[in-house]
Amino acid sequence: ATKLTEEKYELKEGQTLDVKCDYTLEKFASSQKAWQIIRDGEMPKTLACTERPSKNSHPVQVGRIILEDYHDHGLLRVRMVNLQVEDSGLYQCVIYQPPKEPHMLFDRIRLVVTKGFSGTPGSNENSTQNVYKIPPTTTKALCPLYTSPRTVTQAPPKSTADVSTPDSEINLTNVTDIIRVPVFN
């Protein structure tokens, strides 16, 4: 059985979430990967995705989200810059592998963003910045519209910390390709 695990990140507005998703298998290196938010009772929403095929060390930017796939390490690096309180929520990485369902990567990320910029960021000390310079060679990738006969039967489990997610949508600029994909356990 799949064991859903979460990593909690507590950051201030203006800081950067900088995390990695481990995709384990070399066969997934070139697969398209996506960063999703999970809201209780809803299907995950894709906020950004890599190109197809996914290129090595090639930044893809969608609004304030930057994805970089490092094939040599089997890791997808995800950055969300200039965080806002409304970004709080549960996130996950998935690998698109049509016609099969997306392959979910652990751990899920429980992000808690609080008001007030602090010079002592704690858990994200290397990634604190109000102004973020976007790499010059970023690309915007179109995320595939993925459909499946399976439907959501239950909400994803809540964190033990039980952090509430704001009802408002995430305010990410230039996100034109938000899609829905099914939850699977």
Epitope: T5, D22, H73, G74, R77, S123, N124, N126
Partner: antibody, heavy 117, light 111 residues
């Protein structure tokens, strides 16, 4: 070529601390995890913990909580392992390793730490 | 933590024959349809080398005579045909959950 270069052997007194270094070449440590592994003479391998250099987050084996502190300096692509309150049980070779496929690859050559009065 | 028990502790195999090393986990190391079991080889005076990751995937530059299998709690490393160069210690390691843990090791020698 991808490489991890570790600091030279250390001879330290009981009760003292030691800080080992591991410098990456051929890749940026921000883009991976760095792990540390202990191997006592003629014995097996023990995972100490790992760091995500991009955000400073660390994970440790319970046995090494309070004993080991893992840090990283991304400007020099160097990870560090500090060991405190050293005893003879800490005499070992300490390896840093890069990360691949949910495990460890790109091993450093190891640093021998000898605790002796 | 997940405890890994390797067997046998030592093994002698004739050149050209098959060597099989087993590793049993105290609980399943499967998650998301993947077995998080890895195998390392360590020769005397050398650093460990990744042979197999995720139960059955060969590490970079690893000869085809090394193969891994298993799922859940029971895994094995097979070496066939055995060569002189394969004399070493072999360790299994799980990366399903922290703390990552290693088996006690198996010493493989030529008979």
């Amino acid at each position: 070529a991808v490489q991890l270069q570790q600091s030279v052997a250390a001879l330290v007194r009981p009760g003292a601390s030691v800080k080992l270094s591991c410098t990456a070449s051929g890749f940026n440590i921000k883009n991976t995890y760095i792990h540390w592994v202990k191997q006592r003479p003629e014995q097996g391998l023990e995972w100490i913990g790992r760091i995500d250099p991009a955000n400073g987050n660390t994970k440790y084996a319970p046995k090494f909580q309070g004993k080991a502190t893992i840090t990283a300096d991304t400007s020099s692509d160097t990870a560090y392992l500090q060991l405190s309150s050293l005893t003879s049980d800490d005499t070992a070779i300490y390896y840093c390793t890069g990360h691949y496929g949910s495990t460890m690859d790109y091993w450093g050559q190891g640093t021998s730490v000898t605790v002796s009065s | 933590e997940i405890v890994l028990t390797q067997s046998p502790a030592s093994l002698a195999v004739s050149l050209g024959q098959r060597a099989t090393i087993s590793c049993r986990a105290s609980e399943s190391v499967d998650n998301y349809g993947i077995s998080f079991m890895n195998w390392f080889q360590q020769k005397p005076g050398q650093t460990p080398k990744l042979l197999i990751y995720a139960a059955s995937n060969q590490g970079s530059g690893v000869p085809a005579r090394f193969s891994g299998s298993g799922s859940g709690t029971d895994f094995s490393l097979n070496i066939h045909p055995m060569e002189d160069d394969d004399t070493a210690m072999y360790f299994c390691q799980q990366s399903k959950e922290v703390p990552w843990t290693f088996g006690g090791g198996t010493k493989l020698e030529i008979k």
